[in-house]
Amino acid sequence: MKVLQEPTCVSDYMSISTCEWKMNGPTNCSTELRLLYQLVFLLSEAHTCIPENNGGAGCVCHLLMDDVVSADNYTLDLWAGQQLLWKGSFKPSEHVKPRAPGNLTVHTNVSDTLLLTWSNPYPPDNYLYNHLTYAVNIWSENDPADFRIYNVTYLEPSLRIAASTLKSGISYRARVRAWAQCYNTTWSEWSPSTKWHNSYREPFEQHHHHHHH
């Protein structure tokens, strides 16, 4: 039994780090393997993570952490019974993948304006809470080419757009993801998408203008 692709880990900078790796053949990860991790610090404690299968030869482990600070460094030992398959280390602050935003809602009751709001995935006492920026993806279910990204570089988890920037009378979907420049994070996963029917009254002049063409 050998490790084909060494473990790579990402942290949500809150309470969970996720490590993935591949073995050289089909493996029952939960019965055959254990990932031990320990904070490199005075009087720290060794923890054991029981991996799950992630495809035939792939394994994934969710490491629980009480808190994360930028100096934290963990040793990682991957065991198959009494055999040490791999030894490494992981610094969560250098491999951050934020949690996905949630509760994405499209408010269509403001005349001719779409207001999209979502929730910051972190509590106010987490360092990332005030450092997230977002990307909002809006696309048409009817037209695959009608696909756009709005970058939200301010802290407020909301986006206002004119309904007229989208086509009227058709359904759209939106989703949002987050990243934090301060830790040069990767993008989070996309939030679950939400759907709405885009309809707005065109101004008379615009309607008249279109009529003559």
Epitope: F41, L42, L43, S44, D66, V69, A71
Partner: antibody, heavy 119, light 107 residues
Amino acid sequence: QVQLVQSGAEVKKPGASVKMSCKASVYTFTGYNMHWVRQAPGQGLEWIGGLHPGNGDTSYNQKFKDRATLTADRSSNTAYMELSSLRSEDTAVYYCALTTAGRAWFAYWGQGTLVTVSS
Amino acid sequence: DIQMTQSPSSLSASVGDRVTITCQASQDISNYLNWYQQKPGKAPKLLIYYTSRLHSGVPSRFSGSGSGTDYTFTISSLQPEDIATYFCQQGNTLPWTFGGGTKVEIK
């Protein structure tokens, strides 16, 4: 809410030993470290040492290495500190303080045990 | 041992004032700097850990900053219940050491 309850005040003669206790109201003692900090009357704080109750690992301030002994009883979530060869300058309030295992900040403190060393 | 020099040793301020306390370490402590509040006859309480992290349940008027050897603790708007002695503590290098304390009083 985590609570640490320490044993009562002690009066000792120079050269004697004192053993004090600290009972923690935590679900599992092993996820924490128990440290001991003292404060002489009107003075600052001084770290004595710490213990991981799960594996018995200890770390001491060299100043107390030869006189302080830290132990724990996992079955009762109780930590102990024994200080030997007492002298008058050991008169102080002794606090137990809890950290999450491997952390350097004292999140929870006991109410303190006053130890008076006097002939 | 790392020496923690805290200043001022005491201060007097009015309710609503911004209060700042500094702590200087004799060598780099890599942000392992914590702040505690102690009221007379009571045990210390953790306010700020790892330079700027607010401990759970601590009011947001308390904050911390700094790096390397120099650290600052701030009360943005002093309240009557903030009357206490404040200590810094480094947890980077053994033995862990504390500052001498700053006694905060109301004018």
